[in-house]
């Protein structure tokens, strides 16, 4: 979690002098409670926006917006603490709006926005706006919280952000998979414009089940420059198991910008409409773990064989 470095955030508006300050997420009013405290924010909304840094990079940001309730407690409102909590890591980042003048009621409802929290693709957050000072220990809460889910890099707007492009979001392999005779699959995909190797991960499943009955990994060496953007064709030999008929093919690239952590693309071949009654399939534990670069796979001969060529 971090704050956008540019432009400087602004909280001042007509009728209010205000400055944005970094916060430790522990406002002084927690330690020294006040007798009179403001009511909670109203209509807190969190939206996905996009912003450029000074260097021209594009990042997803959480656009936070809320309004004030129209009660007399705004006379005691000294500011607001904005907090973003990343749910999985428990990492929290806060900023404080410090009001330098007293709020007064006027003809329109007071509205505040902040769009400087940079968020990560495919992450989950809880956003909280606390009005300051915070209430006494047994007082009514004067904060509002909302959850916020940032889409992954397959989302159209996310695709062109700097973090997504760094993980290979612009590569569209356009995978095709066809079933051949003699228990074979032909996989075809478009190579990217980088001299880097790829891995094809094949996982097969019985009809209507989610536990694999066959797995195979195939390495594709780095293409030469004249092969960039060309189709690569690979023929994979399947294990002859009746009922092991649904095949998921995943292609993992190893681009220089993301190494072992690049976005993967997959395609699935469904079982034929009327599958045979499946034979008992032995328990089979997955031996590879996506997101890691190394593999515990045995030699190709152990799991089936494959060959490939680049198609110009």
């Amino acid at each position: 979690l971090r704050l956008l470095d540019f432009p400087a955030p602004v909280c001042a508006q007509e009728g209010l002098s205000c400055r944005v300050k970094n916060s430790t997420c522990l406002d002084d009013s927690w330690i020294h409670p006040r007798n009179l405290t403001p009511s909670s924010p109203k209509d807190l909304q969190i939206q996905l926006h996009f912003a450029h840094t000074q260097q021209g990079d594009l990042f997803p940001v959480a656009h936070i917006e809320w309004t004030l309730q129209t009660d007399a407690s705004i006379l005691y409102l000294e500011g607001a603490e904005l907090s973003v909590l990343q749910l999985n890591t428990n990492e929290r980042l806060c900023v404080r709006f410090e009001f330098l003048s007293k709020l007064r009621h006027h003809h329109r409802r007071w509205r505040f926005t902040f769009s400087h929290f940079v968020v990560d693709p495919d992450q989950e957050y809880e956003v909280t706006v606390h009005h300051l000072p915070k209430p006494i220990p047994d007082g009514d809460p004067n904060h509002q919280s909302k959850n916020f889910l940032v889409p992954d890099c397959e989302h159209a707007r996310m695709k062109v952000t700097t973090p997504c492009m760094s993980s290979g979001s612009l590569w569209d392999p356009n995978i095709t998979v066809e079933t051949l005779e003699a228990h074979q699959l032909r996989v075809s995909f478009t190579l990217w414009n980088e001299s880097t190797h790829y891995q094809i991960l094949l996982t097969s499943f019985p009809h209507m089940e989610n536990h694999s009955c066959f797995e195979h990994m195939h390495h594709i060496p780095a293409p030469r420059p004249e092969e960039f953007h060309q189709r690569s064709n690979v023929t994979l030999t399947l294990r002859n198991l009746k009922g092991c008929c649904r095949h998921q093919v995943q292609i993992q690239p190893f681009f220089s910008s993301c190494l072992n952590d690049c976005l993967r693309h997959s395609a699935t071949v469904s079982c034929p409409e009327m599958p045979d009654t499946p034979e008992p399939i032995p328990d089979y534990m997955p031996l590879w773990e996506p997101r890691s670069g190394s593999s515990d796979y045995k030699d190709d001969d152990d799991k089936g064989s494959s060959h490939h060529h680049h198609h110009h």
Partner: antibody, heavy 116, light 107 residues
Framework: QVQLVQSGAEVKKPGASVKVSCKAS????????ISWVRQAPGQGLEWMGW????????KYAQKFQGRVTMTTDTSTSTAYMELRSLRSDDTAVYYC?????????WGQGTLVTVSS | EIVMTQSPATLSVSPGERATLSCRAS??????LAWYQQKPGQAPRLLIY???TRATGIPARFSDNGSGTEFTLTISSLQSEDFAVYFC?????????FGGGTKVEIK
């Protein structure tokens, strides 16, 4: 391929405890939270809470507060959900699922039957 | 807590036809809505999140419309594998809550 594999069915007496396991493979357990959801026979889905394997942080539904404990063992990529003081209306299929908001991969479910 | 209400409880549709499922939240949840599909004896499967983003591998015939309190899941042309129970779920605030489900059955 992301997979969550849960422990087998359990039959328990009222007042007993049950501990359901959920083994994750195909991704690193600490990269995402694990949520637990249950489904009584023929009924809808009920959220129980979540745990972050990365931080150990938990959030439980108020209904289960004090009766449920969620833990993880990162060395075995396994999450656990223990429910204590079981009652007959705790009879349900208990699911683990990846993530904390929109749950993208689910275990196959563990049927817990509470009967005297 | 936010109450999610789905309608109808059962929807009878012929294969190839369009199915429209409704989900209503008791208060505004912005776009913080997910849809799941569940077949008998199986775990739910995530279809859509953020009220409109399809999960990985979900066909384009599934789409959602709505934000705030009213949401609609549309299956443009029902395939045989689409007959199942569909649940909506809000993740706007804790606790997460699910709708009661809509069963889509063959007419």
């Amino acid at each position: 391929q992301v997979q969550l594999v849960q422990s087998g069915a359990e039959v328990k007496k009222p007042g007993a405890s049950v501990k359901v396991s959920c083994k994750a493979s195909g991704y690193t357990l600490t990269s995402y939270g694990i949520s637990w959801v249950r489904q009584a026979p023929g009924q809808g889905l009920e959220w129980m809470g979540w745990i972050s394997a990365y931080s150990g942080n938990t959030k439980y539904a108020q209904k289960f507060q004090g009766r449920v404990t969620m833990t993880t063992d990162t060395s075995t990529s396994t999450a656990y959900m223990e429910l204590r003081s079981l009652r007959s209306d705790d009879t349900a299929v208990y699911y683990c699922a990846r993530r904390q908001l929109a749950l993208d991969y689910w275990g196959q479910g563990t049927l817990v039957t509470v009967s005297s | 807590e936010i109450v999610m209400t789905q309608s109808p409880a059962t929807l009878s549709v012929s294969p190839g036809e369009r199915a429209t499922l409704s989900c209503r939240a008791s208060q505004s949840i912005s776009s913080n809505l997910a849809w799941y599909q569940q077949k008998p004896g199986q775990a739910p499967r995530l279809l859509i999140y953020g009220a409109s983003t399809r999960a990985t591998g979900i066909p384009a015939r599934f789409s959602d419309n709505g934000s705030g309190t009213e949401f609609t899941l549309t299956i443009s042309s029902l395939q045989s594998e689409d007959f199942a129970v569909y649940f909506c779920q809000q993740y706007d605030t804790w606790p997460l809550t699910f709708g009661g489900g809509t069963k889509v059955e063959i007419k």
